[in-house]
Amino acid sequence: AARPGFQQTSHLSSYEIITPWRLTRERREAPRPYSKQVSYVIQAEGKEHIIHLERNKDLLPEDFVVYTYNKEGTLITDHPNIQNHCHYRGYVEGVHNSSIALSDCFGLRGLLHLENASYGIEPLQNSSHFEHIIYRMDDVYKEPLKCGVSNKDIEKETAKDEEEEPPSMTQLLRRRRAVLPQTRYVELFIVVDKERYDMMGRNQTAVREEMILLANYLDSMYIMLNIRIVLVGLEIWTNGNLINIVGGAGDVLGNFVQWREKFLITRRRHDSAQLVLKKGFGGTAGMAFVGTVCSRSHAGGINVFGQITVETFASIVAHELGHNLGMNHDDGRDCSCGAKSCIMNSGASGSRNFSSCSAEDFEKLTLNKGGNCLLNIPKPDEAYSAPSCGNKLVDAGEECDCGTPKECELDPCCEGSTCKLKSFAECAYGDCCKDCRFLPGGTLCRGKTSECDVPEYCNGSSQFCQPDVFIQNGYPCQNNKAYCYNGMCQYYDAQCQVIFGSKAKAAPKDCFIEVNSKGDRFGNCGFSGNEYKKCATGNALCGKLQCENVQEIPVFGIVPAIIQTPSRGTKCWGVDFQLGSDVPDPGMVNEGTKCGAGKICRNFQCVDASVLNYDCDVQKKCHGHGVCNSNKNCHCENGWAPPNCETKGYGGSVDSGPTYNEMNTALRD
């Protein structure tokens, strides 16, 4: 038998060489080209396991897109035909709570999550006999990467499920800790930087296959929370990085989410974008914003993929994506996940399991409406590969998909056997569908979320609400004391109230200057390299938030450190959430906050508000009867008609949908 080369096993402290056998009903046989379902016998630590796999048809959209750039820097769009891909999910026969994510492209490669251990498997290099290496994931050497705080062991969870009869694949994969009864879908977009692309030999196909493999691993980890990962797109910076990756992790993350908002969202709708970088940040494995998965401006993370395996890297991306989904670090909390460390532990431990705390954090996000974008089942043109009626995703060619026959008994609109609408039905799902009928045009489907937001309405001929828009960045709000920024009116008092309760308000400017000139964790203008930056006096209002009149101490599932600083007859209150270096600090002043006349905070600096590019003269453009929205169109007050609020009408904009039902005014009046 071939022996593994040094390269292949140098990262392993222990491994076995095995030969998996493919199972058919008649006999064991050597492998042949992959199919929709397949079973193998594999050996691990002296035991034989039968593994059952099915192609992960939920993984890729039919219109999965890959963006690259040519030598001139021109964007190239490719829709690779990868419907019959070789990426599988599955379970181990007879092992409770097991799950598997494997590719069967060139031998078996992937992860097996058993009850008490996770294994990696990969083809043995240069073997002509289908030999593979199998190893415990605990036996993988990892450089000590972190997300800020030191690693702590988690108590082992010993609960076991009782099983009566062999469940179906779907039941098995859903059985693990389904935090909420309703499945959530994360439409994930991955961006790969130039250095990582170079590291992969500038082979676009290899990068693409590796990222699909990564998404399959993520899906296998998130399924325990009843969250599905759908990889909707991939961008490879083949011609050079499109953001500046010099500086600390926070700088790069900020640059990335700004680029995403400006260039990526308009090209491909998605819920979260993750940047994959080769460059490290002094032991920090990644960084992401917390609870921002549905945010236009902050739904992103950065992830360091250096000299580690894709299996190990998957836990880093799972961790950073977890932050986007509202999950805080497990450290210092009473969390358990059935392993010695969990995915959201601050040290990048290579764990495959989410803890009870992560489940609770995600549930809080959904209860606070922070995860509304995860409810949409991808539309037919975004639905994944290998269309399949009964998978609860509306694939191309389907009008609806109510799931299993039993689930479909409860659906009045959808014909379960054909995934077509019943004869009398106009729709089966969506914000603008009720009782199998389109809601009338003009029905509010997305209400305002702040004074800087605008509502959207059903159009009467679609089950979907109009795309979300808000008032253009830079529009004055809060009686001219603040500016609108990404749909929110950003001002100090409101930020203090979010953290310290409804009576709190901003501390005097002297507090900001005194505290933020120190350059420590309680007063700073960001983080550079390994140290906090002191604020120059002119930027002090853009550093740590300082509040007064505090009557409530915040509790966000994580206990923050609070500091009081006496200053000129008042107490300045600030907070450090100790979320670790991979999480932007929610105790800092928000971007877009007005820090002076005609100035706003950006990147912890007080800069000219012209950077917001507000260019709407509401008197001229909207005739004094409306505001400009984020698409630079007028949103008219009730009583005036779009597009320019010049004539009498019923409000709204060309983007919002109609505010009343033009087709049936008799019904209305």
Epitope: C433, K448, T449, Y650, Y660
Partner: nanobody
Framework: EVQLVESGGGLVQAGGSLRLSCSSS????????MGWFRLRPGKEREFVAA????????DYVDSVKGRFTAIADVAKKTVFLQMTSLKPEDTAVYYC??????????????????WGQGTQVTVSS
């Protein structure tokens, strides 16, 4: 303009049920989410429940959860408040109101643009 008219109030014994109706008119009635508020003697106006016209999103004050249900019928241009297991402390004037705010703002009376005239609910012990 949206006009709102409540009905269905009355006197009921503790443990009993009532169904309040709020009929809306005006060309843009469905362009608003609908809320129910109540004014109890000697107290401030209090949020009770809210619903969107699809019925897919609902919200309730803790004290009525499990007892009150908001229902929206877009064809009849009416929202209902089904009240069961009524208690003496539910005695109040109940108002329906219309807002363009979503669930992040619809508990606050200040974000409502149109109000009905109110209907009295009295629960005797």
């Amino acid at each position: 303009e949206v006009q709102l008219v409540e009905s269905g109030g009355g006197l009921v014994q503790a443990g009993g049920s009532l169904r309040l109706s709020c009929s809306s008119s005006g060309r843009t009635y469905s362009a608003y989410n609908m809320g129910w508020f109540r004014l109890r003697p000697g107290k401030e106006r209090e949020f009770v429940a809210a619903i969107n016209w699809s019925g897919g999103t609902q919200d309730y004050v803790d004290s009525v959860k499990g007892r009150f249900t908001a229902i929206a019928d877009v064809a009849k241009k009416t929202v209902f408040l089904q009240m069961t297991s009524l208690k003496p402390e539910d005695t109040a004037v109940y108002y329906c109101a219309a807002t363009q705010w979503g669930s992040s703002g619809w508990k606050q009376a200040r974000w409502y643009d149109f109000w009905g005239q109110g209907t009295q609910v009295t629960v005797s012990s």
